[in-house]
Amino acid sequence: IKVLGEPTCFSDYIRTSTCEWFLDSAVDCSSQLCLHYRLMFFEFSENLTCIPRNSASTVCVCHMEMNRPVQSDRYQMELWAEHRQLWQGSFSPSGNVKPLAPDNLTLHTNVSDEWLLTWNNLYPSNNLLYKDLISMVNISREDNPAEFIVYNVTYKEPRLSFPINILMSGVYYTARVRVRSQILTGTWSEWSPSITWYNHFQLPLIQR
C-alpha cells in the first residue's frame, strides 16, 4: 500500500480533526491501517490512535477527538499499515480550520416585501468562531441550480434579508449556507442542509 500525496487534515476548532488520504489500491481502512497522533512539545501528551474508515475503496478518513485547540497546538501524526510506516507529518488545528456546517436554516416571511433567512451558528459563545465566522448564502432555482445568487454575509448575525421580487415569481427556490473563519487559515464548511420554498408575489399591474 502507498499513500498518494499528503493526507488532508482539517479541524472543526471545537472537538474533532479529520484527516483523509488517498491510496494506490483498494484497502479495508479499519483493518489494514491506523493513524497515531500526539500533541507535540508537551511532555505528558499521550499517544492516541484513530481507526480509519473507508470513504471510498481507495480513500480512508479518520475522525480524531481532540481537546479544544489553542493556537500553539501541533500534532505529530504517523500512518501505519501493520508494522510499516506509510507517512508521518504534523498538523496544526488552528492553521487548518473547516468549521461545522450551520444548521436549522429557516425562511421567514417578513412584514415588508422581503424574505428573512436565519440559521444557527453551532459554536458556543466562548469559542473563537462564535464571533469570527462569515457566511455565504447560495439561492438557486430548484429546476436549474446553475441559475443562482450568492450573498456574502459580512456581519456576525446569522441572518439575511432579501427582497422577494429579486427572485422570479411562481418558481421553487433552494437556499443553503456555509461559513468560514476569518482570522484562522482554512476552508469553507460543508453546505448546510438546504431548504426549498415556492416564491410567489403579486406582480404590479403594469408587468402582468
Epitope: L128, K131, D132, I134, Q182, I183, L184
Partner: antibody
Framework: EVQLVESGGGLVQPGGSLRLSCAAS????????MSWVRQAPGKGLEWVSI????????HYAESMKGRFTISRDNAKNTLYLQMNTLKSGDTAVYYC?????????????WGQGTQVTVSS | NFMLTQPSAVSVSLGQTARITCQGG??????ASWYQQKPGQAPVQVIY???NSPSGIPERFSGSSSGDTATLTISGAQAEDEADYYC?????????FGGGTTLTVL
Amino acid sequence: EVQLVESGGGLVQPGGSLRLSCAASGFTFDDYAMSWVRQAPGKGLEWVSIISWNGEITHYAESMKGRFTISRDNAKNTLYLQMNTLKSGDTAVYYCAKNHYTLTWGYDYWGQGTQVTVSS
Amino acid sequence: NFMLTQPSAVSVSLGQTARITCQGGNFGRYYASWYQQKPGQAPVQVIYGSSNSPSGIPERFSGSSSGDTATLTISGAQAEDEADYYCQVWDSSGYKFGGGTTLTVL
C-alpha cells in the same frame, strides 16, 4: 461615538521595553478584532499585529514576531502592545485600530497614535 | 507572499479626476481598503471591500478592482483631498499596506 486613545509611548533606549495601551469606548469592544499599525517618521503605514475578539488568536508582522506581544482585556475595554528588545528601527507613531467585523474590510476607526522613540 | 505597489506621487488639477493604483494583489481573491492620511493626523478609511464607501466619505471617492490592480478614483478632486493614500489587503494571517501615494491637487 467610537474613541480609541493610545498611551504609553515615550523615549526608550535600544534593547529596552515599552507597553502601549489603547482605551476603547463607544462600541462593543469584545465583538471585534483589534490591531496595531505603526508609521516611522516620513514613511508609510506598517501593520504590526492583530488579535481576535477573545484574545485567543494573534498574528504578527514577521519583523516583530518574538519581540512584540499583543493582548487585550475585554473587561477593561483595553488593547495592549508589549514591545521588548526595541531597536532604533522601531521608532514610529503607533496607532491602535478597530477592525470591521469583516476582517477583509480593514479598519473603520483609528486612534490618534502614540509616539515611540528608540534612541540612546 | 506578495507586495502592494503604489505610485509614489500623483498630481491632479482641481476639479479633475485622480486615479491611484495599487498593484500586486490578487484582487479577485483579496478586497482592497483605502485610507487617506493628512499630515499630523491618523488615517481615515475612504473605501472598504474594494468599492464601498463608509458613511461620511464624499461621493467623489470610489473604488474598483480588476485582476492584480485595485484603483481609487477621486472624481472632481478638491483642495482638501491633498493627502497621502494607502491601499491595504488582508490575507488570512495579517495585513499588507501599499507604500503610499502622495496626491497633489494643482
